[in-house]
């Protein structure tokens, strides 16, 4: 998995008038890292992990960059011609990556009312847009504004390709991101489903990195994919992830089923609790 830094900026307009506030979220290696969600931006680390990465310093630099980018995006939204009455949003997502072989990738994507209409490869400076006429109109609108206003909106390009990578390298230097392996806590619960059946759910939480194998086995053999329901692997707000897998089994056969978990080279199996009690499995030994 490459290391990545992802900026997600959102600005809003109401009845054609651009609102003063904006929302900025920054993800480091897919984890919520920084956030600005007030009228007046103040970069806030998302959890202890983010604070550890940033170290003992103020986040003035991050605040300055995010505020500047928010202002630029508001100016861009103001130049979108076809704004109808009501609420509209313009979103810019910028991503840079450093791969294992040290190669880099950077891209920028614009969304209007949640719909992608313009993308740019920040290395090749190549623009792409969806085929729909609405997207093409919006794309031309925004591209023209960015070209015309390139001098005025220097800050718009400030945290792009080079600076995004510079920031990412700076964060990685802390070592916190590179070193981190946090094993999951796994717990198995049961609930009545229908007559003679129970649903067993296996939850893994608090793990990092996000790659995990979680599956149900009967007598040691994996159940087929279509007999299991998987939850997405989602950030849990603490710089770690959570997920779950569930399946339906016959009541009385609980002892035959185990939840198998594999993460960062470690593995464990977790039985179904015999009663309706929640059984907590600790970290692996």
């Amino acid at each position: 998995e490459p290391h990545s830094l992802r900026y997600n900026l959102t600005v809003l307009s109401w009845d054609g008038s651009v609102q003063s506030g904006f929302l900025t979220e920054v993800h480091l290696d897919g984890q919520p890292f920084l956030r600005c969600d007030r009228q007046k931006c103040r970069a806030k680390p998302q959890g202890q992990w983010a604070e550890d990465v940033l170290g003992n310093k103020t986040w003035d630099r991050e605040t300055r960059d995010l505020t500047g980018n928010g202002k630029d995006l508001r100016m861009t939204l103001a130049h979108i011609k076809d704004q109808k009455e009501g609420l509209h949003s313009l979103q810019e997502i910028r991503v840079c990556e450093i791969h294992e072989d040290n190669s880099t990738r950077s891209s920028q994507h614009f969304y209007y009312d949640g719909e992608l209409f313009l993308s740019q490869n920040l290395e090749t400076k190549e623009w792409t847009m969806p085929q729909s006429s609405r997207a093409q109109t919006l794309a031309m609108n925004v591209r023209n504004f960015l070209k015309e206003d390139a001098m005025k909106t220097k800050t718009h390009y400030h945290a792009m390709h080079a600076d995004c990578l510079q920031e990412l390298r700076r964060y990685l230097k802390s070592g916190v991101v590179l070193r981190r392996t946090v094993p999951p806590m796994v717990n198995v619960t049961r609930s009545e489903a229908s007559e003679g059946n129970i649903t067993v759910t296996c939850r893994a939480s608090g793990f990092y990195p996000w790659n995990i194998t979680l599956s149900w086995r009967q007598d040691g053999v994996s159940l087929s994919h279509d007999t299991q329901q998987w939850g997405d692997v989602l950030p849990d707000g603490n710089g770690t992830y959570q997920t779950w897998v569930a399946t339906r089994i016959c009541q009385g056969e609980e002892q035959r089923f185990t939840c198998y978990m594999e993460h960062s080279g470690n593995h464990s199996t977790h039985p179904v609790p015999s009663g309706k009690v929640l059984v907590l499995q600790s970290h692996w030994q």
Epitope: Q218, D219, G220, V221, L223, Q255, R256, E262, G265, P271
Partner: antibody, heavy 122, light 106 residues
Framework: EVQLVESGGGLVQSGGSLRLSCVAS????????MNWVRQAPGKGLEWISY????????YYADSVKGRFTISRDNAKKSLYLQMNSLRDEDTAVYYC???????????????WGQGTTVTVSS | DIQMTQSPSSLSASVGDRVTITCRAS??????LNWYQQKPGKAPKLLIY???SLQSGVPSRFSGSGSGTDFTLTISSLQPEDFATYYC????????FGGGTKVDIK
Amino acid sequence: EVQLVESGGGLVQSGGSLRLSCVASGFTLSSYSMNWVRQAPGKGLEWISYINSRSNTIYYADSVKGRFTISRDNAKKSLYLQMNSLRDEDTAVYYCARVSSITGNTGAFDVWGQGTTVTVSS
Amino acid sequence: DIQMTQSPSSLSASVGDRVTITCRASQSISSYLNWYQQKPGKAPKLLIYAASSLQSGVPSRFSGSGSGTDFTLTISSLQPEDFATYYCQQSYSTLTFGGGTKVDIK
């Protein structure tokens, strides 16, 4: 006594079909996952198919996928293997085998039948 | 698919010898590994499950070890009835057997 007895083997032309049966006794078949395993003359064991107790998980070895179908009828205490488009290389002794239900099991086969011989000739 | 490689494919030993058979998986299979014994004209018999657990009724001279990709079946003191072919089998990803190890009299 816990026992598995296979039947249905015999001589069949290449491209032909055959249905093997395996009857269980001494235990409740419906509670167990079952398998078919074969052994070509002078060769090693080859797992070919698995079906779990609820028949909602079925696996096949690549060598038989699309040609063989595993099924079970718990009321008749029987496991089946429908073999179509038979080839010379399907010639083997076919065993049915039960997956152990012991706690901590890892898909081990604790009860085996005596085997039934299938010969495919071209 | 996971490949299971047994070595040696055959070995000659005497009664009382300590015999070791190895099984290597093409990728990590945790402890999802079982061992069987088969005598000519007979069905296989389960010896060890979960890499190291002895199946009920199997003599304690048989033992298994290993985890991940490398596994070992050991017969501490070979008895006359132990001359047979031994197979490993994995259930980590569907199911596959190793090629077998034939143990015959030296």
